[in-house]
Interface confidence: low
Amino acid sequence: YDFTNCDFEKIKAAYLSTISKDLITYMSGTKSTEFNNTVSCSNRPHCLTEIQSLTFNPTAGCASLAKEMFAMKTKAALAIWCPGYSETQINATQAMKKARKSKVTTNKCLEQVSQLQGLWRRFNRPLLKQQGSSDYKDDDDKHHHHHH
């Protein structure tokens, strides 16, 4: 899915109001320095691509994130604010339902959610433009104007 045409400000608002808190709840009891961030992203569409992958694609050692509260709210936000996103996720959702057996918070899952926090953090602070403008605008965002 190409996240270029999402309404980034609305997704940001959803993250700030609820998703961020759900991520913190999931990570409660874990030191913020326990995991090193190894996944990064360079602009908002790229960040959403990485967020989508880490949140919904089962990985070795962590197959159980998709039904977590933060994941469901992420899915809802993407479905509402990214045109055509829902249609691309129907088959993937079926596969996830089959893959899910039980809710187990493994260390691998905690590490994955720590990476997600880093990706969301980058999504929420898009890079400054290289032209030296006094405007705070994502260097890759042509259609959405947003101040922080």
Epitope: N37, S42, R122, L127, L128
Partner: antibody, heavy 121, light 105 residues
Framework: EVQLVQSGAEVKKPGASVKVSCKAS????????MNWVRQAPGQRLEWMGI????????SYNQKFKGRVTLTVDKSASTAYMELSSLRSEDTAVYYC??????????????WGQGTTVTVSS | EIVLTQSPATLSLSPGERATLSCRAS?????MHWYQQKPGQAPRPWIY???NLASGVPARFSGSGSGTSYTLTISRLEPEDFAVYYC????????FGGGTKVEIK
Amino acid sequence: EVQLVQSGAEVKKPGASVKVSCKASGYTFTDDYMNWVRQAPGQRLEWMGIISPYNGGTSYNQKFKGRVTLTVDKSASTAYMELSSLRSEDTAVYYCAREDYDYDGYAMDYWGQGTTVTVSS
Amino acid sequence: EIVLTQSPATLSLSPGERATLSCRASSSVSYMHWYQQKPGQAPRPWIYATSNLASGVPARFSGSGSGTSYTLTISRLEPEDFAVYYCQQSDNVRGFGGGTKVEIK
């Protein structure tokens, strides 16, 4: 532990340029913005500009536009602030300050120790 | 450019008293940060995003406000609280207020 270590004091003549460095350690340099703030003797804090070490993107206080240049050396985790066409009123302590995204807001959470720049003929 | 105006410029109080510092923005901002500065030292982050105390800041400090009006309150002044406090916004280009000096009466 996050640390920002700035270069030493400078004495410059009017019309000259000064380049102040700020070496960052204890965090991933490209993950956060770097601000430059100055404070003239007995005066308020004055924001000069900001740079994203990730891509070199900058934004400046209009007051300094054309006179201040912010750069980074990613390999050395060091930010630089160069101020040209110095005048006596540029005499101040110059600070670098990391800007972190936390609590749903951008704040300057770590500051360098400050570099005193004196402009005098 | 958003202009931040702090009042009063100087607040003369005795230890144990309550201090109320005001910061007004020329247009609405999402949140306000506060910094404490003592003579010869770099500013220290004191309150993040309107109401979140920075690490190590005593609970007698609190922050509140929204829109164009923000407040830093010290419920009972201790000797170490006497300093200059600056508000700062980061909605657009960053900017600081003129500072409020809290001095011993």
